[in-house]
């Protein structure tokens, strides 16, 4: 057969459906490897021709259209399952083609089993809601395309294997779920079933994301530098060790980058020929604002070292704060012997 | 212990209305979809309608759609079946059932059922 | 609407027996079907959900299990008490549909 423009498998796009419920899948050729839409090549007079492997196999077969109920159909750009079998999992590839153009791209379908209470092996979506913000939603995903704007379908939102009714502060309000006040009881793992007639079936929908409660932005401060301060005193003699701990409090933000760094003498540890190491560790509490501790170690400190400036800075989309470690070097004790001799006057 | 008590039943001619009630306790009503089902002498379950635990949706049987009205109210713990333009068809026992909150949505509860006999 | 087809209809057994009693759908309701027990002149009572799930209180004797289409209400040793009426019920849909019903009556 003649050359065909392979865009191989495309596992960034590692689709996941439930069993027993409706799947639309886009042909991803469109959507992110091609620079024109499905109209345009369809008006081009281009073919496209769906066929896929199954699991555990490498035989590349054609798709069968032809099961009872049209189980699995072609629309435009898009494969249709009504509904979704286990067995369904594998490979998918669509291709693009005429006489004289053809692309093509592979992508894994993998189709999962749901207990009753909405379990499963899933990669779940993380919805962050802002603690004590006034009201928040999340909407039921994914959904559109599915039934026409007539169908009016039923939805219920779970929280767990619950049904939300009447709970404190979160309400449904069809394909929105609605936090008046999220609080950190809020986190888990919120499910709507969407159920929709077709053809005189009934089908669900069911997507299920996981709530994560964070430090709200009306509360973000800058970081926070709680070591090295000013109470604290590193006194060494040379050939000690010297640990120096950075510890850095930052508040959740949104897609904020957090870093800690130390500077000796105004440059990076990287940049200077001292034995330097530096050890890093990150907490989190339960709004996910963070804490970082980055221990800088002289295993053997010289008296050179102790005149040096360590300085501990800190960044994050709220600002930046430095703080200067207090190094100083021991001075040694006098020796006992001579201090009582000169305290009494010896000679 | 949860409690459903049906009450409302008797004899009514075709074409007339009739209204059931069931009243609840033992526990929080307003958190629970409530059903009604039916039993003609001698047959099987039917099921008749249900009302979320807050009356925003309402489904029926279309044997009833149009006819039978679920309504709740909250503040009484009672649970509605408004019957209207009843047929000969309709003489069964009427039970309420809770629906326990899960996916699955089982009837966990039933009250005894009270008799609605539709003759002229 | 979902059509739920039991059978049998009617099964006479003896005590001690292990009996099955099936539902089939006329289409796929995954999980999202209960079995009850009804004893003349009395409310049905709920025995199992979801397929398989056993409700508080009930023997083990009693099981579930199939999805899709196809259920299966089992008793591993039948008592005395177990004689009644047995239906499916299916959830999947706004509108619930019960099974006809299956009569276990002593041989």
């Known amino acids: 057969s003649e050359r065909c423009d392979d865009w191989g498998l495309d596992t960034m796009r590692q689709i996941q459906v439930f069993e027993d419920e409706p799947a639309r899948i886009k042909c991803p050729l469109f959507e992110h490897f091609l620079k024109f839409n499905y109209s345009t090549a369809h008006s081009a007079g281009l073919t496209l021709i769906w066929y896929w492997t199954r699991q555990d196999r490498d035989l590349e077969e054609p798709i069968n259209f032809r099961l009872p109920e049209n189980r699995i159909s072609k629309e435009k750009d898009v494969l249709w399952f009504r509904p979704t079998l286990l067995n369904d999992t594998g490979n998918y590839t669509c291709m693009l083609r005429n006489t004289t153009y053809c692309s093509k791209v592979a992508f894994p379908l993998e189709v999962v089993q749901k207990d009753s209470c909405f379990n499963s092996p899933m990669k779940l979506p993380v919805h962050k809601l802002y603690i004590e913000y006034g009201i928040q939603r999340i909407t039921c995903p994914n959904v559109d395309g599915y039934f026409p704007s007539s169908v009016k379908p039923t939805i219920t939102w779970y929280m767990g294997c619950y049904k939300i009714q009447n709970f404190n502060n979160v309400i449904p309000e069809g394909m929105n779920l609605s936090f008046l006040i999220a609080l950190i009881s809020n986190n888990g793992n919120y499910t709507c079933v969407v159920t929709y007639p077709e053809n005189g079936r009934t089908f669900h929908l069911t997507r299920t994301l996981t709530v994560k409660v964070v430090g709200s932005p009306k509360n973000a401060v800058p970081p926070v530098i709680h070591s090295p301060n000013d109470h604290v005193v590193y006194e060494k003699e040379p050939g000690e060790e010297l640990l120096i701990p950075c510890t850095v409090y930052f508040s959740f933000l949104m897609d904020s980058r957090n870093e800690v760094w130390w500077t000796i003498d105004g440059k990076k540890p990287d940049d200077i020929t001292i034995d330097v190491t530096i050890n890093e560790s990150i907490s989190h509490s339960r709004t996910e604002d963070e804490t970082r501790t980055q221990i800088l170690s002289i295993k053997k400190v010289t008296s050179e070292d102790l005149k040096r400036s360590y300085v501990c800075h800190a960044r994050s989309a709220k600002g930046e704060v430095a703080k200067a470690a207090k190094v100083k070097q021991k001075v040694p004790a006098p020796r006992y012997t001579v201090e009582l001799a000169c305290g009494f006057g010896a000679t | 212990q949860v409690q459903l008590v049906e009450s409302g039943g008797g004899v009514v001619q075709p074409g007339r209305s009739l209204r059931l009630s069931c009243a609840a306790s033992g526990f929080t009503f307003r958190n629970y979809g409530m059903h009604w089902v039916r039993q003609a002498p001698g047959k099987g379950l039917e099921w008749v309608a249900v009302?979320?635990?807050?009356?925003?949706?309402?489904f029926y049987a279309d044997s009833v759609k149009g006819r039978f009205t679920i309504s709740r109210d909250n503040s009484k713990n009672t649970l509605y079946l408004q019957m209207n333009s009843l047929r000969v068809e309709d003489t069964a026992v009427y039970y309420c059932?809770?629906?326990?909150?899960?996916?699955?949505?089982?009837?966990?509860?039933w009250g005894q059922g009270t008799l609605v006999t539709v003759s002229s | 609407d979902i059509q739920m087809t039991q059978s049998p209809s009617s099964l006479s057994a003896s005590v001690g027996d292990r009996v099955a009693i099936t539902c089939r759908a006329n289409q796929s309701i995954a999980s999202y079907l209960n079995w009850y027990q009804q004893k003349p002149g009395k409310a049905p009572k709920l025995l199992i959900y979801?397929?398989?799930s056993l409700q508080n209180g009930v023997p083990s004797r009693f099981s579930g299990s199939g999805s899709r289409t196809d259920f299966t209400l089992t008793i591993s040793s039948l008592q005395p008490e177990d004689f009644a009426t047995y239906y499916c019920?299916?959830?999947?849909?706004?509108?619930?549909?019960f099974g006809q019903g299956t009569r276990l009556e002593i041989k």
């Open positions: 019920q299916q959830s999947y849909s706004t509108e619930i549909t």
């Open positions: 059932a809770r629906e326990e909150g899960i996916a699955v949505a089982p009837f966990d509860y």
């Open positions: 979801g397929a398989s």
């Open positions: 009302i979320w635990y807050d009356g925003s949706n309402k």
